[in-house]
Every structure is written in structure tokens, then in C-alpha cells.
């Protein structure tokens, strides 16, 4: 927790709240993250195969950021998703997209972030992924790509 | 603060936030900011030669946009950075970053944003700055470039 | 809400938050806001022709996203501005904006997306509101263009 | 059909200061950057400023930079060039030009004002 | 900063001739460079952008080409409302001028 160890616990409630930043090693989708070690927290919601689960229904505000680069620009199209899963509903929810497309000039190096957040009603035991649509573009670096949210 | 007197003081503690704007005499990193005039507000956090200043330990949502433009499109790598300091600790911490490469034109006029938000577990006494990798390629309207927190 | 009824009321005092979602009929400025189907949130806080209006005093963040995109880059600058209303003053505010400038290749298929968010102090009857400088190059999907808000 | 016309050119001491201005039409004038150009008699061509738009950006070169400040008012279609601390060596034939869809060229010109800085 | 240096400085030519007027760029400046004439009294008149790409409404006589440092345009049939002087500007880093090239009657 930046370098803190984290506060000492209150007698208040346990406040819900996770950031997760990017783990090098993911290999297929949705994305996997560092959950333990650098600037990393995770309080009060369990983080499973990818996915932040919920473990208290209310509002929570969730957000993503996913640095992508690469060697030499071809403008493949490059999507960000943060979506919802519940075993209750068949289809995974798309909660927030980003998508960019001809955002760099070919044979170039190139970078671009792609940022998301915003406000949803959760569910206990709804699962939250981020997916990407070129992982090999995706720089990990915990400052760079991560996965967060916190309950109102 | 958005041309309104700001809030009654109520009971409650007062509630640690943070909205700073740009300041175009900035000169040097980390930015500067403007912290008494404007769309400005400073509750609970001091302002110290750039940076917010942690006064309760806690979680904080922190967030900045940086917007960059230019006249004559280059391509120079640009970067935006919050980071921590604090003097317990040797090293500042990187927090957050964007970096964009190949994002314009050659030769066009340009402008891009880069935004940054996530939380995090601060400590009393942290100080956070704001750094960019060229000054001159920064606009600093009020609206356009910033940087804040507030305490969950 | 993400398919979820709403949590069942608290005797604690109702939150206050907004997410609304892109209306693909959108026809002039403002933008126009999906307020009741989908993945929207609508509570302690009214919407009313384009506009989230503020009912308590207090402090909120704020945030918005859009989505363009186009069928032939032309390089038209595009402009997302969230700014406030209210009717003891003249002049609309700017609290945040976002500009984009030869961000894609001329001639081909593109899309970029504009991310603002922040704190602001809001005083009851404030309206907010999002604006767009190209109408026609924004795409309304709910996961793409949204904007939002809750009181801290 | 396109049109932008300079005025308020004159002699002026070193030192003083003048104000220029350009009132454009037969274009949406708040869609496009306008430069400043200037050209000293019998000589070439020297770009002076630019303004965005929306009037949000300016950019100026070296030679001018802190003395001259570049504006535009969208709502009257005109844009405006205010020299202060003038030298012998900004007198020049003053052009206004429309930049060509934000690439630094520029597509059409004015027909220029004379300021001459003399004592 | 780029400098941009024309030559020849003046070119004597009678009507009908085939005229070359040469640009360089003190350093790379891919194809963005524009030309411009410019006639005593008056101001510049837009013609090619992109170092070959002519504006509409100039004559087809008119061309450009080049591309790094080396730029011409080319008078295929000189005309007698064509002499005038001619000015390069590159618009790849910045805004630069050449010192112009005035093209008289011989």
C-alpha cells in the first residue's frame, strides 16, 4: 500500500475497496492481476481468476486504465471492457467500453491509454473482469494498467 | 468553488477534499497549481509548493488530467505522472501514469488529454505531485488541467 | 440497474448519484441522456432535458465519457465539455473539458474516446450538462457514452 | 466567396503600442486558426502568430513573443493582433491568412496593413 | 529550427518556357511543404500543398514535387499573369519561409 502498512482496523465497518494493477504474466482473457505485492488493495471484496467479486450489494464507483503500446504502429483496433458476471444471468454485462481505432501513424512506436469509470448498482456475488482485445499490446507496469472500485 | 460560498460547516468532521487547477507561470516540475481562485477547493489537505499535502491517514481517490497540445505536431513522448513522496522513505513513488507516443500528425496542429484516477491507501505526511514530461506543451485552463482527491 | 432491482431502501438518508447512458436521438446541444432503461441509476438527484440537477448542497464528483468515432478521419476538432447552469447566474461554467486535434489518420475509419472527472462543490438547483462539439461523430452506446455523478 | 481585411496600421513611435484587427466572411470564421503574417518591405515572408479556433491556444514566434498577443472575438467574426513595446524592425506589411484544416499552410490571405515604426 | 533556402534567388524566362524553382530543407521535412506566389502590392496566392498536391483553381500547369529535403516547382508553360515571386513553407516542424524566388520577363 504504497509503501504503508494499512491503517489500523476501526470499529467502523470494513470499507469495500480494491486496486489491482497489472500482472505481466496474463495470458488469455479476461485479465488477470497482481492482488498481493506494490500498490495494491483489496479490502472487503475477494479477487477471484480475474475478477473482483462482490460481496455487499449497493453503489459502487469502478474504474480501469490499460496502457497499450507497441513497436511499430499498424492501428489494429484496441478495445478496453469492464464487464459483469453473474451466474444468475446468462450474458456477461458490458459495464464501460473503450475502443480505439487509426490513433497512431503506421511504423511508428507507439502508446495510448484508455481510461473508464463510473457508477454502477451491484450485487453480491456479481464478478467484475476487464478484457482487452490485444494483450500482446498491453504494457503491465503496476502505475500503468489497473483494476479498481470502491463502495459508496 | 464553482461560484458558490462554500457549504455550511456542519458537525461532522470536515470532510478532506481536494480540486486544483492549473497554473500557466508554472516553470519547473513537479506542476504547480492554483489552489485560491476559480473552480478551486482545498478542505482537510494543505497545498505546499505543488503538491497535496496528507494530513489523516486513510483512503483517498485520487485523480489528475493533464491537457497537452502544441502548434506544430512533433510527436515528442509525453507523460504524465502522480506521484508520492514522503520523507520516511528514500525513492518517490510512481502512482500513476499515462504516456503517449505517436498520437499526432506530423506537422498539424494537436491536442490531447491524458486522465488518471484510482485509489489509494495514503499515509499523513504523503505528499503527492503532479509531473509532466514538457511543460511547454501543457494547457493549463481550469477546466482542461488539474489535479484532486478526496478522502472516501 | 446492471439487471439488479435496486437495494432495498435504507433507513439511513438516500444517496445521491446519477449514471445516465448515451440516447441515440440526441439532436441538438446538450446531449440527452438515457434515464430509465439499461444500465442507468437515477437517485436524490433529477433529470431534466439534458440536464442532472443538483437538489442538495454539497460536494460531488463528477464524470463523463464519450465516445467518437467516424467513417473517414477528417482531423474535425472535437471538444466534450461537462458545465453548469443555474439561473442566479449569466454565464454557463466550464468544470471540466476535454479537446482532441489530429488524433487519427486522414482518410481512415477511427474512433478515440474523451474521460472527465472531478470534484465539485454543487449548490442545490445547479444543472449539469454535457456538450459535444460534432453530434454525428458520437456513438450513444450505453457502455460507451455515459455521465454521472455522486454526492461524497 | 472568402474574404479577410486587415486595418488599424499607421506609424508608430518605438516603443508604442498598436492594435490590429481582421474582419473576415464568407466562412464560418469560428471553425478555423488564423494566422498573423508579416513581410518587411522588400522582403520575405515571416509568420508572426496563430490562434485556435476557438480561441483556447496561441503560439507565437520568438521575435514577437511577449510583446504581441494574439486574439479573436468569434461572436463579430474578427481577429486582432496588439503589439506593444514596438521596434523599427516589426515594420512590415501585416497579413491575416486562414489556416488550411489546422495544417500551418494557409489558404487564403488579406490584403495587408502597412505599420511603420518610426521616430 | 528549419531553415528553407530557394534557388535560383531571381530566373529570367520568356513566355512559354518550362521553368524549375528549387526548395531545400535544412533537415528532413517528409512532404510538408507549400508554395505561394506573390505578385508586387498584393498578397500571397495559395498553390500546392504537400509538396504536390495542387490547390483548386491553379492552373494545371503548375506542379510540385519532392520530398525530405529537395522540393520543385515546376512552370510546365509559362504564362504572362505567371511572373511574380514565389515563396516555399514548410509546415513540418513549426512555420518557415524560403526568402522567395522572383521570376522577371527576359
Known amino acids: 500500500q504504497i509503501g504503508h502498512p494499512s491503517p489500523p482496523p476501526e470499529k467502523k465497518e470494513q470499507r469495500k475497496v480494491a486496486h489491482l494493477t497489472g500482472k505481466p504474466n496474463s495470458r488469455s482473457m479476461p485479465l488477470e492481476w497482481e492482488d498481493t505485492y506494490g500498490i495494491v488493495l483489496l479490502s472487503g471484496v475477494k479477487y477471484k481468476k480475474g475478477g473482483l467479486v462482490i460481496n455487499e450489494t449497493g453503489l459502487y464507483f469502478v474504474y480501469s486504465k490499460v496502457y497499450f503500446r507497441g513497436q511499430s504502429c499498424t492501428n489494429l483496433p484496441l478495445s478496453h471492457k469492464v464487464y459483469m458476471r453473474n451466474s444468475k444471468y446468462p450474458q456477461d454485462l458490458v459495464m464501460m467500453e473503450g475502443k480505439m481505432m487509426s490513433y497512431c501513424t503506421t511504423g511508428q512506436m507507439w502508446a495510448h491509454s484508455s481510461y473508464l469509470g463510473a457508477v454502477f448498482n451491484l450485487t453480491s456475488a456479481d464478478h467484475l473482469y476487464v478484457n482487452v482485445s490485444e494483450l500482446s499490446l498491453v504494457n503491465f507496469e503496476e502505475s500503468q494498467t489497473f483494476f479498481g472500485l470502491y463502495k459508496l | 468553488q464553482i461560484g458558490h460560498p462554500s457549504p455550511p460547516p456542519e458537525k461532522k468532521e470536515q470532510r478532506k477534499v481536494a480540486h486544483l487547477t492549473g497554473k500557466p507561470n508554472s516553470r519547473s516540475m513537479p506542476l504547480e497549481w492554483e489552489d485560491t481562485y476559480g473552480i478551486v477547493l482545498l478542505s482537510g489537505v494543505k497545498y505546499k509548493k505543488g503538491g497535496l499535502v496528507i494530513n489523516e491517514t486513510g483512503l483517498y481517490f485520487v485523480y489528475s488530467k493533464v491537457y497537452f497540445r502544441g502548434q506544430s505536431c512533433t510527436n515528442l513522448p509525453l507523460s504524465h505522472k502522480v506521484y508520492m513522496r514522503n520523507s520516511k522513505y528514500p525513492q518517490d513513488l510512481v502512482m500513476m501514469e499515462g504516456k503517449m507516443m505517436s498520437y499526432c500528425t506530423t506537422g498539424q496542429m494537436w491536442a490531447h488529454s491524458s486522465y488518471l484516477g484510482a485509489v489509494f491507501n495514503l499515509t499523513s505526511a504523503d505528499h503527492l505531485y503532479v509531473n509532466v514530461s514538457e511543460l511547454s506543451l501543457v494547457n493549463f485552463e481550469e477546466s482542461q488541467t488539474f489535479f484532486g482527491l478526496y478522502k472516501l | 440497474q446492471i439487471g439488479h432491482p435496486s437495494p432495498p431502501p435504507e433507513k439511513k438518508e438516500q444517496r445521491k448519484v446519477a449514471h445516465l447512458t448515451g440516447k441515440p436521438n440526441s439532436r441538438s446541444m446538450p446531449l440527452e441522456w438515457e434515464d430509465t432503461y439499461g444500465i442507468v441509476l437515477l437517485s436524490g438527484v433529477k433529470y431534466k432535458k439534458g440536464g442532472l440537477v443538483i437538489n442538495e448542497t454539497g460536494l460531488y464528483f463528477v464524470y463523463s465519457k464519450v465516445y467518437f468515432r467516424g467513417q473517414s478521419c477528417t482531423n474535425l476538432p472535437l471538444s466534450h465539455k461537462v458545465y453548469m447552469r443555474n439561473s442566479k447566474y449569466p454565464q454557463d461554467l466550464v468544470m471540466m473539458e476535454g479537446k482532441m486535434m489530429s488524433y487519427c489518420t486522414t482518410g481512415q475509419m477511427w474512433a478515440h474516446s474523451s474521460y472527465l472527472g472531478a470534484v465539485f462543490n454543487l449548490t442545490s438547483a445547479d444543472h449539469l450538462y454535457v456538450n459535444v462539439s460534432e453530434l454525428s461523430l458520437v456513438n450513444f452506446e450505453e457502455s460507451q457514452t455515459f455521465f454521472g455523478l455522486y454526492k461524497l | 466567396q472568402v474574404q479577410l481585411v486587415e486595418s488599424g496600421g499607421g506609424v508608430v513611435q518605438p516603443g508604442r503600442s498598436l492594435r490590429l484587427s481582421c474582419a473576415a466572411s464568407?466562412?464560418?470564421?469560428?471553425?478555423?486558426?488564423i494566422h498573423w503574417v508579416r513581410q518587411a518591405p522588400g522582403k520575405g515572408l515571416e509568420w508572426v502568430a496563430v490562434i485556435w479556433y476557438d480561441g483556447s491556444d496561441k503560439f507565437y514566434a520568438d521575435s514577437v513573443k511577449g510583446r504581441f498577443t494574439i486574439s479573436r472575438d468569434n461572436s463579430k467574426n474578427t481577429l486582432y493582433l496588439q503589439m506593444n513595446s514596438l521596434r523599427a524592425e516589426d515594420t512590415a506589411v501585416y497579413y491575416c491568412?486562414?489556416?488550411?484544416?489546422?495544417?500551418?499552410?494557409?489558404?487564403?490571405w488579406g490584403q495587408g496593413t502597412l505599420v511603420t515604426v518610426s521616430s | 529550427d528549419i531553415q528553407m533556402t530557394q534557388s535560383p534567388s531571381t530566373l529570367s524566362a520568356s513566355v512559354g518556357d518550362r521553368v524549375t524553382i528549387t526548395c531545400r530543407a535544412s533537415q528532413s521535412i517528409s512532404s510538408w511543404l507549400a508554395w505561394y506566389q506573390q505578385k508586387p502590392g498584393k498578397a500571397p496566392k495559395f498553390l500546392i500543398y504537400?509538396?504536390?498536391s495542387l490547390e483548386s483553381g491553379v492552373p494545371s500547369r503548375f506542379s510540385g514535387s519532392g520530398s525530405g529535403t529537395e522540393f520543385t516547382l515546376t512552370i510546365s508553360s509559362l504564362q504572362p499573369d505567371d511572373f511574380a515571386t514565389y515563396y516555399c513553407?514548410?509546415?513540418?516542424?513549426?512555420?518557415?519561409f524560403g526568402q522567395g524566388t522572383r521570376l522577371e520577363i527576359k
Open positions: 513553407q514548410q509546415y513540418n516542424s513549426y512555420i518557415t
Open positions: 504537400q509538396a504536390s
Open positions: 464568407g466562412f464560418t470564421f469560428s471553425t478555423y486558426g
Open positions: 491568412a486562414r489556416d488550411r484544416d489546422n495544417w500551418n499552410y494557409f489558404d487564403y
